[in-house]
């Protein structure tokens, strides 16, 4: 950056190199060039010469004043016009930054995605700070009183192998940057209560032509959690409002759920699950589309599958959702 140049003098910022956005600031430039009494001192911001609010303080020093500085980052340098020199002579440069102190982190959430081997902790960082802001996640065992700290710039994945202090912990987050420091409330967790089952996916749909046609949705998960509660939501693609059905599920078998839907309408389905009685849900699964037939039966699939867990037969769909390989997202 601009700070790596060889200086023939000194440049400094008041109140500081990193300051609160919207402040009035002064940038000072002092020349120390051999055999040069500067005729004029010039300031440049991001390579563009500044023309206003420059005050000469003495023979070697000048000040540039900015009112209500709102740029997150700027590179400043200053030059001198020396007698007998055709070009301006570089004095020095400095990168400056403006931003905000961190907000108090809130909505601290820690979950263990099944099979991940990690406890993932996230929080709402609040408003954008514009400057480098670090977070320290504190994890304190309620059984051993031992505390571990993890430094990060966003969320944190903590290996469950490193959580050796039993099952109950306090978690809190400290946010800090050059302009301030804040600390969240403490979250109390029990490791057994924060597991989110492996992603549920909808694999295919078929509409059976009966007196009242019915649509069967086939859905599945890799989870080995025994008691799982799930919700399936569905709506016509033209509608705004979702219908929701609830299920208590054991994924020993592929799940089959029946719906009585209007003919010749395109529907969209999603599913999500949680360990029964626990706090956190999976994010909703990818969108799965199925158009009900006018009269003839229709299958939204490329192959059929028996409904035993280890059948070995295959499933494919023509759903056009978006892929999320480890299914992280909203968990509230």
């Amino acid at each position: 950056g601009i700070t790596n140049i060889n200086c023939s003098g000194h440049i400094w910022v008041e109140p500081a190199t990193i300051f609160k956005m919207g402040m009035n600031i002064s940038i000072y430039c002092q020349a120390a060039i051999k055999n040069c009494q500067p005729r004029k001192l010039h300031f440049y911001k991001n390579g563009i010469k500044e023309r206003f609010q420059i005050t000469r303080i003495n023979k070697t020093t000048a000040r540039l004043w900015y009112k209500n500085f709102l740029e997150p980052h700027a590179s400043m340098y200053c030059t001198a016009e020396c007698p007998k020199h055709f070009q301006e002579t570089l004095i020095c440069g400095k990168d400056i930054s403006s931003g905000y102190p961190p907000d108090i982190p809130d909505e601290v959430t820690c979950v263990i995605y099944e099979y991940s081997g990690n406890m993932t902790c996230t929080w709402n960082a609040g408003k954008l700070t514009y400057i480098d802001t670090k977070y320290v996640v504190h994890v304190k065992s309620l059984e051993t009183e031992e505390e571990q700290q993890y430094l990060t710039s966003s969320y944190i994945n903590i290996s469950t192998d490193s959580l050796q202090g039993g099952k109950k912990y306090l978690v809190w987050v400290q946010a800090a940057n050059a302009l301030g420091m804040e600390e969240s409330k403490q979250l109390q967790i029990h490791l057994d209560d924060i597991v989110i089952p492996s992603a549920a996916v909808i694999s295919r749909a078929e509409t059976i032509n009966a007196t009242v046609p019915k649509t069967i949705i086939y859905w599945d998960s890799q989870t080995t959690i025994e008691k799982v509660s799930c919700e399936m939501r569905y709506k016509a693609t033209t509608n705004q409002t979702w219908n929701v059905k609830e299920f208590d599920t054991n994924f020993t078998y592929v799940q089959q759920s029946e719906f009585y839907l209007e003919p010749n309408i395109k529907y969209v389905f999603q599913v999500r699950c949680q360990e029964t009685g626990k706090r956190y849900w999976q994010p909703w699964s990818s969108l799965f589309f199925h158009k009900t037939p006018e009269t003839v039966p229709q299958v939204t699939s490329k192959a059929f599958q028996h409904d035993t867990w280890n059948s070995g037969l295959t499933v494919a769909s023509i759903s056009t959702g978006h892929l999320t390989s480890d299914n992280r997202g909203d968990i509230g």
Epitope: A199, V201, D220, S221, V315, A316, S319, L323, D326
Partner: nanobody
């Protein structure tokens, strides 16, 4: 259509080793997570190991430091190296995979038929 075929099971003495393989074939655009599960009794499946597409691995506590999962993305194959086997490891071992069959579709779950591993004392 996607098939998963396991191989490498068999009878082994306690303390011995086996290497299981599971090859995926068919309409595959991309395989994300791949898993090994085992089932000693009906309706009692147990997760063994998981490997992500980037080869990050996690293991059940019961097999940690004894089993190693690996994969070859070019061959759409996942492996399970099982060392220091115990009679309690006796089960049918299944591989499963989160597969995208084309670039537009969400991933689907596919499962193999399983290969039997018997550990004698």
């Amino acid at each position: 259509e996607v098939q998963l075929v396991e191989s490498g099971g068999g009878l082994v003495q306690a303390g011995g080793s086996l290497r299981l393989s599971c090859a995926a074939s068919g309409s595959i655009f991309r395989i994300n997570n791949m898993y090994w599960f085992r089932q000693a009794h009906e309706n009692q499946r147990e997760w063994v190991a998981r490997i992500t597409r980037e080869s990050d691995t996690t293991y059940a506590d019961s097999v940690k430091d004894r089993f190693t999962i690996s994969r070859d993305n070019a061959k759409n194959t996942v492996y399970l190296q099982m060392n220091s086997l115990k009679p309690g490891d006796t089960a049918v071992y299944y591989c499963t995979a989160d597969v995208q069959t084309n670039s537009r579709d969400a991933q689907q779950i596919f499962r193999g038929q399983g290969t039997r591993v018997t550990v004698s004392s």
